[in-house]
């Protein structure tokens, strides 16, 4: 018989990670803290008017490798950084917008030859 307070070894389960969330808080978040089995992230991107907007929150383990890979998106300036090393680690992430390329100045149908 097992003594009370004694059990067999735990099965491997993900340990919840708490992240700061801003502009990206899920319905279960409390006090701008969300919970995930994956990564914390901070992202900066331009909105439609060209103003930089910083977003932070939680990414689930599934698909987060792809989301955390900062692959360039045509005609969209954005940068994302992810972390898992401690709770609220994304407080210390400060991604910066990639530099403007010449073609990013092209507005609508006007083309420079």
């Amino acid at each position: 018989k097992k003594e009370d307070g004694e059990s067999t070894a735990p099965t491997a389960r993900p340990k919840v990670l708490r992240c700061k969330c801003h502009h990206h808080c899920p319905e279960d978040s409390v006090n701008n803290i969300c919970s995930t089995d994956g990564y914390c992230f901070t992202m900066i991107e331009e909105d439609d008017s060209g103003t930089p907007v910083v977003t932070s929150g939680c990414l689930g383990l599934e698909g987060s490798d792809f989301q955390c890979r900062d692959t360039p998106i045509p005609h969209q300036r954005r940068s994302i950084e992810c972390c898992t090393e401690r709770n609220e680690c994304n407080k210390d992430l400060h991604p910066t917008l990639p530099p403007l390329k010449d073609r990013d100045f092209v507005d609508g149908p006007i083309h420079h030859k």
């Epitope: 307070g5 735990p10 993900p14 340990k15 708490r18 899920p26 319905e27 279960d28 689930g60 401690r86």
Partner: antibody, heavy 117, light 113 residues
């Protein structure tokens, strides 16, 4: 196997403080959150708070902020809960328990705290 | 805080009977991101610490007899013991693990006739 060892009982005078311990073994101490739960005789269970031993990050139930302080000593794989300004309302069984995702996989046997002069 | 309400507060059953107990939450425990219900059930025998029976509403903990069945979604949950045994005499608590502060129901006491 997982063990969470807690002293059986503590007797403390009103107004004093007490530091309850929970010694963990049988698993990697930093891989699970450590929680503390209060149970008064014949009553339900109340979550006090939790601590992540890997970075000492804590969450507290608002009701126990200022009453309970959670700490860990990773070298000895021991979690502690200090309770301050004790009154008879603090007399209860206090359990430590571990979790991966906020449900309690394993529980200690509990420490019965009696506050009496 | 999420309020958990259990009913009945006690029930007396004979060995072999089917037992059903209810747990209701003041808000939905269903996470849209993964379609899981964040509800756990525990058994506490007299003089012992609680023991995990079910998590995510219906996932039985390893080593728990299959007569214990968790079901439900959203705000309404049920623990069923398909054929109650003498060793099932205990208090049963539900707990939401949807967000902090984690909260428990007041419990259902199972007594044997």
């Amino acid at each position: 196997q997982v063990q969470l060892q807690q002293p059986g009982a503590e007797l403390v005078k009103p107004g004093a403080s007490v530091k309850l311990s929970c010694k963990a073994s049988g698993y990697t101490f930093t891989s699970y959150w450590m929680h503390w739960v209060k149970q008064r005789p014949g009553q339900g269970l109340e979550w006090i708070g939790d601590i992540d031993p890997s970075d000492r990050y804590t969450n507290y139930n608002q009701k126990f902020k200022g009453k309970a302080t959670l700490t860990v000593d990773t070298t000895s794989s021991t979690a502690y809960m200090q309770l301050s300004s004790l009154t008879s309302e603090d007399s209860a069984v206090y359990y430590c328990a571990i979790s991966g995702w906020d449900y309690f996989d394993y529980w200690g046997q509990g420490t019965t705290l009696t506050v009496s002069s | 805080d999420i309020v958990m309400t259990q009913s009945p507060s006690s029930l007396a059953m004979s060995v072999g009977q089917k037992v059903t107990m209810s747990c209701k939450s003041s808000q939905s425990l269903l996470k849209s991101s993964n379609q899981k219900n964040y509800l756990a059930w525990y058994q506490q025998k007299p003089g012992q610490s609680p023991k995990l029976l079910v998590y995510f509403a219906s996932t039985r903990e390893s080593g728990v007899p299959d007569r214990f069945i968790g079901s439900g979604s959203g705000t309404d949950f049920t623990l069923t013991i398909s054929s109650v045994q003498a060793e099932d005499l205990a208090d049963y608590f539900c707990q939401q693990h949807y967000n902090i502060p984690l909260t428990f129901g007041a419990g259902t006491k199972l007594e044997l006739k």
